[in-house]
Structures are given as C-alpha cells and as structure tokens.
Interface confidence: medium
C-alpha cells in the first residue's frame, strides 16, 4: 500500500526584501512524488526552484524538499503543490509570525 506524506512549509529570511520558502515532504511511500512551488496557481520553472533528492528516511519511507526565493509581502501568491499516489494537496506559506505549517495528507 501507499503511505501519504507529511507536508511542512517553512520560511526563512534570505536577503533584504526576500525570503526563502521550503516545502518538505516526509514519511511517504512509494518514492514517486511531485513537489513543486506554484505562483498564482501555476508551477514555477525548474530554474527558480531547488530540489532535494528523494531519500530514504530509515523507516521504509522517503523524504524530499523543494525551495524557492520569493519577495516578502507576496507570500499569499505562493503555494506548495504535492501529488503522491493519485492524491494531491496544496500548502500555503505560513505568515511571518508562524514559521511552521504541518499537514498530513490523507
């Protein structure tokens, strides 16, 4: 069977006026997954995103991440899109005073 990923979005200051947003998917099986940042609903180009390898996490499941740099104040335009085993979900960038957003996808 399949195990749905836990998706976690974080933000960190990159440079003045910019922030780096990172979307992490963990504890999923099988290893095939789509994880990408979207702006206004459409996927960003590959060259504006950085991906981590899909790695085993030691529990028979996998983990990966994708990050991109965006302008501070435009967070609401960006979402992390995840597709795994025929299911998909969308995850927002947390507001500045809340650095974590967890969602276990069912």
């Amino acid at each position: 069977g399949s195990v749905p990923p836990m998706v976690n979005v974080t933000r960190s200051e990159a440079s003045e006026g910019n922030i780096t947003v990172t979307c992490r998917a963990s504890s999923f099986y099988p290893r095939n997954i789509t994880l990408t940042w979207r702006q206004d609903g459409v996927s960003l180009s590959h060259d504006t995103q950085q991906w981590g390898d899909v790695l085993p996490d030691g529990n028979g499941t996998y983990q990966t991440w994708v990050a991109t740099r965006i302008c501070q104040g435009e967070e609401q335009r960006f979402t992390c899109y995840m597709e795994h085993s025929g299911n998909h979900s969308t995850h927002p960038v947390p507001s500045g005073n809340s650095h974590h957003h967890h969602h276990h996808h069912h």
Epitope: Q39, D40, G41, V42, S43, L44, S45, T48, Q76, R77, T79, H88, S89, T90, H91, P92
Partner: antibody, heavy 122, light 112 residues
C-alpha cells in the same frame, strides 16, 4: 465542468457595502482558484482578485485592495466578494470565474458565473 | 501594469470570411515559468465571456477549429477561418503572466 451560480442584482446607495456570492457545484471546490472580475456597461473587463478555495489565500489587483474582500465558505462551496464604500464608479456587472490549472494546465477564466449587476445610486 | 491594445476596434465581416484580430502588449508577457499566458475570450451581448484560446494557441474544450491563435513576445493574433453567425460579438485578449492580469479593450466583430 460544473456550475457557478451568482446572486441577484443589487441596488445600493453610495457609501454602502455589498456582498456578492458565487455558489459552485459539480467540481471539487477546495481544489480551485476563483477570480472576480468587473465590467462596466459597454466596457472591457478588469480582474479584481483571486482566492484559492483550499487555503483562503488571495491575490488582489492593487487598484481594488481597499475596495474588495474575498472569502470562501467551503461547507457550502461558495465564494464571496464584499465591495465597500461604494460610489457610482462601482456600478458594473461583477463576474466570478474559475481557473482551470488541472485540465489544461493554465487557463485563467475557464468557467464563468452569469454575472451580478450592481447599481450604485442615491 | 501591462497595457493590452486590440485592433481594430470594430471589424465588419461577411459570413464565411476570414477574420484576423490583433492584440499587442506593452511589454513581453512571458511568465517566469516560461509559459506565455495569453488568452482570447468571446462575449456575446447579454452573456458572460467564454474562453476560446489559452496559452497563445491552445483551443479550449469545445471551441471549433476555425479559431486559431498565434504570436509571441508582444504581438498576438486570433484568426477565424470562416466566420459564422454565432461568432459575432466582442473579442477580448487577456494576459495572465504579470499581476495585475489585464484585458484588452476588445474588438467587435459584426456583420458588414
């Protein structure tokens, strides 16, 4: 493709607010981006803002930031736009429209409501 | 804001004619993801607009193949190979690449 049913015509006084609704059916509401657009009689269209029903995230045309507020009620699959401090310049037909990022990977206003006529008059 | 300019304002045609509508953007409308989100809509009197073409040249579902879109950068064209009565109305081009998304002023296709 689903349905988008907008609320009926409104006659409102200057300075008042109005809340328009767009009730959807036939598709998974929370997967969708809904935009609102304005069209004055005999004129072109203006995009006001979008809302992503899954998260409530929004993006506004700066021109309408102080005027419009978009919300959704996922339990009834309905999108709302509240328009405030109305003037005669706000008299127009307002449309809701659904984006189609899944089926065609990038069509903005694929499916439209029938429009709501708002008339601002003393 | 990206200004979308459509010409002509009015296009008188005879049924069966080919019609060519032009749309020019004030700046390049390639999205940061590499796609060009240029769309064409038709609005008939008393109706909501309907999507015809998305991403410059892709016909939306149910749109007849007499409609075709082309162009790149800042210059775009919608062609109707043989105008039928149901094609009459106002055509709007639209760019969804740069916020705020903007429409052209429209071209009215009417009987000559």
């Amino acid at each position: 493709q689903g349905q988008m049913q907008q609320s009926g015509a409104e006659l409102v006084k200057p300075g008042a607010s109005v809340k328009l609704s767009c009730k959807t059916s036939g598709f998974t509401f929370s997967d969708n981006y809904i935009s609102w657009l304005k069209q004055k009689p005999g004129q072109s269209l203006e995009w006001i803002a979008w809302i992503y029903a899954g998260t409530g995230g929004t993006s506004y045309n700066q021109k309408f930031t102080a005027k419009a507020q978009l919300t959704v009620d996922t339990s009834s699959s309905t999108a709302y736009m509240q328009f405030s401090s109305l003037t005669t310049e706000d008299s127009a037909i307002y449309y809701c429209a659904r984006h189609d990022y899944y089926g065609t990977s990038g069509a903005w206003f694929a499916y439209w409501g029938q429009g709501t006529l708002v008339t601002v008059s003393a | 804001d990206v200004l979308m300019t459509q010409t002509p304002l009015s296009l008188p045609v005879s049924l069966g004619d080919q019609a060519s509508l032009s749309c020019r953007s004030s700046q390049n409308i390639v999205h940061i993801n590499g796609n060009t989100y240029l769309e064409w809509y038709l609005q008939k009197p008393g109706q909501s607009p309907k999507l015809l073409i998305y991403k410059v040249s892709n016909r939306f579902s149910g749109v007849p193949d007499r409609f075709s879109g082309s162009g790149s950068g800042t210059d775009f064209t919608l062609k109707i190979s043989r105008v039928e009565a149901e094609d009459l109305g106002v055509y709007y081009c639209f760019q969804g690449s740069h916020v705020p998304w903007t429409f052209g002023g429209g071209t009215k296709v009417e009987i000559k």
